[in-house]
Amino acid sequence: MMTGTIETTGNISAEKGGSIILQCHLSSTTAQVTQVNWEQQDQLLAICNADLGWHISPSFKDRVAPGPGLGLTLQSLTVNDTGEYFCIYHTYPDGTYTGRIFLEVLESSVAEHGARFQIP
């Protein structure tokens, strides 16, 4: 029986040109994590393998950095980076656990404008 749960950073926003950390955490299971895949829609961004380490997809090499931990850092964000991101934990013997993060990339001025109205 799969008892684990994935906690994620949930819905997040960042400004164009900036960077963001995508983070998932698997808890409440004794299962052993053997690999974590990071995907954007159906595109593989990166793999963190327990034995072989990190592999970043060639098309994302310039803008994706491994870590911290099992997380993923996206750099030089564009509006096109807006969308769903998934962390897929391959675990023995439970199976796969999937976490979802929605990232919204805002134009710099929109992000700044929004900041003015934040409650201190």
């Epitope: 299962a31 052993q32 053997t34 327990a50 391959h90 675990t91 023995y92 013997p93 439970d94 199976g95």
Partner: antibody
Framework: QVQLVQSGSDLKKPGASVRVSCKAS????????MNWVRQAPGHGLEWMGW????????TYVQGFTGRFVFSLDTSVNTAYLQISSLKAEDTAVYFC???????????????WGQGTMVTVSS | DIQLTQSPTFLSASVGDRVTITCRAS??????LAWYQQNPGKAPKLLIY???TLQSGVPSRFSGSGSGTEFTLTISSLQPEDFVTYYC?????????FGQGTKVEIK
């Protein structure tokens, strides 16, 4: 090369304890789960459970709780099976086996120890 | 728990024969199934994983197929060293049970 080498066969009296060791070499020990499998004479393979080599957390199959303990010494890349209060029905070959494969659909016991025969007899 | 039933339990065949061993799961296990070969007094050896992927170094006369609840191991042309016991195992969550085994004997 990747291998698991187990301790030698052991003859014990009922009520005694035994410890079987499984030394791994040729790979990163803490990256692959380790399993224990029992095979009684003339019988099939029975999965006893496994130990998370990253956290040291053991999981036991029903029927292998209480008297059976899985442990690790990661400094020497070794997994251990301890059986206490031995009974005649514990007489069997005990295997350690690594879970290979990185993704859920490719898991399998890809490397096995040679087996340790434990005989319990008065 | 998911139970695996292998059939037949015993199989009599001759060198050169094509033989098939079946493994049925009590519930759907996708393709999370492995096949092992065991010689008497030896450790099992992985033949097939993910239902149909041949393990490195295993002769191509061995093949696996199936998904869901029904799986098969086929040996296309039996060799003298193939007259041993075969086990299936599911790896679809805990516990990772084995089938009861199929012993292939010389006719």
């Amino acid at each position: 090369q990747v291998q698991l080498v187990q301790s030698g066969s052991d003859l014990k009296k009922p009520g005694a304890s035994v410890r079987v060791s499984c030394k791994a070499s040729g790979y990163t020990f803490t990256s692959y789960p380790m399993n224990w499998v029992r095979q009684a004479p003339g019988h099939g393979l029975e999965w006893m459970g496994w130990i998370n080599t990253n956290t040291g957390n053991p999981t036991y199959v029903q029927g292998f709780t209480g008297r059976f303990v899985f442990s690790l010494d990661t400094s020497v890349n070794t997994a251990y099976l301890q059986i206490s209060s031995l009974k005649a029905e514990d007489t069997a070959v005990y295997f350690c086996a690594r879970t290979g494969g990185h993704t859920y659909d490719s898991y399998a016991f890809d490397v096995w120890g040679q087996g340790t025969m434990v005989t319990v007899s008065s | 728990d998911i139970q695996l039933t292998q059939s037949p339990t015993f199989l009599s065949a001759s060198v050169g024969d094509r033989v098939t061993i079946t493994c049925r799961a009590s519930q759907v296990i996708s393709s999370s199934l492995a096949w092992y070969q065991q010689n008497p007094g030896k450790a099992p050896k992985l033949l097939i994983y993910a239902a149909s992927t041949l393990q490195s170094g295993v002769p191509s006369r061995f093949s696996g197929s199936g998904s869901g609840t029904e799986f098969t191991l086929t040996i296309s042309s039996l060799q003298p060293e193939d007259f041993v016991t075969y086990y299936c195992q599911h790896l679809h969550g805990y516990p990772c049970n084995f089938g009861q085994g199929t012993k292939v004997e010389i006719k």
